[in-house]
Amino acid sequence: CDLPQTHSLGSRRTLMLLAQMRRISLFSCLKDRHDFGFPQEEFGNQFQKAETIPVLHEMIQQIFNLFSTKDSSAAWDETLLDKFYTELYQQLNDLEACVIQGVGVTETPLMKEDSILAVRKYFQRITLYLKEKKYSPCAWEVVRAEIMRSFSLSTNLQESLRSKE
């Protein structure tokens, strides 16, 4: 399954929207920095592109879940958030089309359950951090920057796999 070119454009638009969502400077939130332990090796490295698809799908689904909470709606600009949801939704559709075709399911041992669990735990650590920090503006800014970093890493790894094939 070849993801459409629009998928790459969508990834770039998602990153642009995340950048535009910034409300305060990360430098004013240095004391709130946190290592969430992003499992970046699970998005590329020794995998074939097909094997990363369920993992990338999980990543985008978790981003969608994280930013579609009541607390998130209160933290970010509503117009940008709506555009962000639309981009994520389209990317989920692209990836689901690939999964339905059987790539990443029939050829993937254990459906990469270990990688998917690692991604879920990563997002739960983020959720717990926000809760502990009482969803403060600095906590949300740390999370926004973290999601930009991890999303960029995961999509870059996907792109490098695509170019190798």
């Epitope: 332990g37 499992p39 669990l117």
Partner: antibody, heavy 119, light 111 residues
Framework: CQSVEESGGRLVTPGTPLTLTCIAS????????MGWVRQAPGKGLEWIGI?????TVYYTNWAKGRFTISKTSSTVDLKMTSPTTEDTATYFC???????????????WGPGTLVTVSS | AQVLTQTPSSVSAAVGGTVSISCQSS????????LSWFQQKPGQPPKLLIY???TLASGVPSRFKGSGSGTQFTLTISDVQCDDAATYYC???????????FGGGTEVVVK
């Protein structure tokens, strides 16, 4: 029949680095999460860490800095960076087929390899 | 660091009887169900009995039953057999994998 076996255990002096190796039979290591667990003589089990199918490594708190887990296409290695007498134990390599239920659900275990750290 | 406390540390059971082993975590395991139970006999590696708190591993007799959620878990062995004499361990998986750990173990003696 799918199995794992550890090797490399021996008597070492404190501070001498030692690498244990886990070899798989009947399956590809690249497709599974593989962990290391140890057991001191007459004591309980201790979770050291795990390497996921993609290569991400997690260590338990006390093991960080003391051990390094790495994976190649044919082996999973556990390097003891600077062993002390407290690291004397049988070291087990294990695989989980149930990673959705956590990284402690190991269902295929090797027989273990004994490491003795003594001066 | 998380602590998994197993009680009792040793228990005696008659053949045909029932044994219950408790495993208490100082914090909820991941997803409230990421807890496994193992059986270990002297000189052998551990054997997985239960994963996901209550799912029986392949080839394990239905006499073994896992229950519980969150922080409190129980392994129950009914119709105890001589072959069940062993040490049993619980193992917890947490949202932060640096906290993954085994319980201290429970020795089951069969009379």
């Amino acid at each position: 029949c799918q199995s794992v076996e550890e090797s490399g255990g021996r008597l070492v002096t404190p501070g001498t680095p030692l690498t244990l190796t886990c070899i798989a039979s009947g399956f590809s290591l690249s497709s599974y999460a593989m962990g290391w667990v140890r057991q001191a003589p007459g004591k309980g089990l201790e979770w050291i860490g795990i390497v996921l199918s993609g290569g991400t490594v997690y260590y338990t708190n006390w093991a960080k800095g003391r051990f390094t887990i790495s994976k190649t296409s044919s082996t999973v290695d556990l390097k003891m960076t600077s062993p002390t007498t407290e690291d004397t134990a049988t070291y087990f390599c294990a695989r989980t087929d149930y990673p959705a239920y956590g990284f402690t659900s190991f269902n295929i275990w090797g027989p273990g390899t004994l490491v003795t750290v003594s001066s | 660091a998380q602590v998994l406390t197993q009680t009792p540390s040793s228990v005696s059971a008659a053949v045909g009887g029932t044994v219950s082993i408790s495993c208490q975590s100082s914090k909820s395991v991941y997803n409230n169900n990421c807890l496994s139970w193992f059986q270990q006999k002297p000189g052998q590696p551990p054997k997985l009995l239960i994963y996901g708190a209550s799912t029986l591993a392949s080839g394990v007799p239905s006499r073994f039953k896992g229950s519980g959620s969150g922080t409190q878990f129980t392994l129950t062995i009914s119709d105890v057999q001589c072959d069940d004499a062993a040490t049993y361990y619980c193992a917890g998986d947490y949202v932060d994998d640096m906290e993954n750990t085994f319980g201290g173990g429970t020795e089951v003696v069969v009379k």
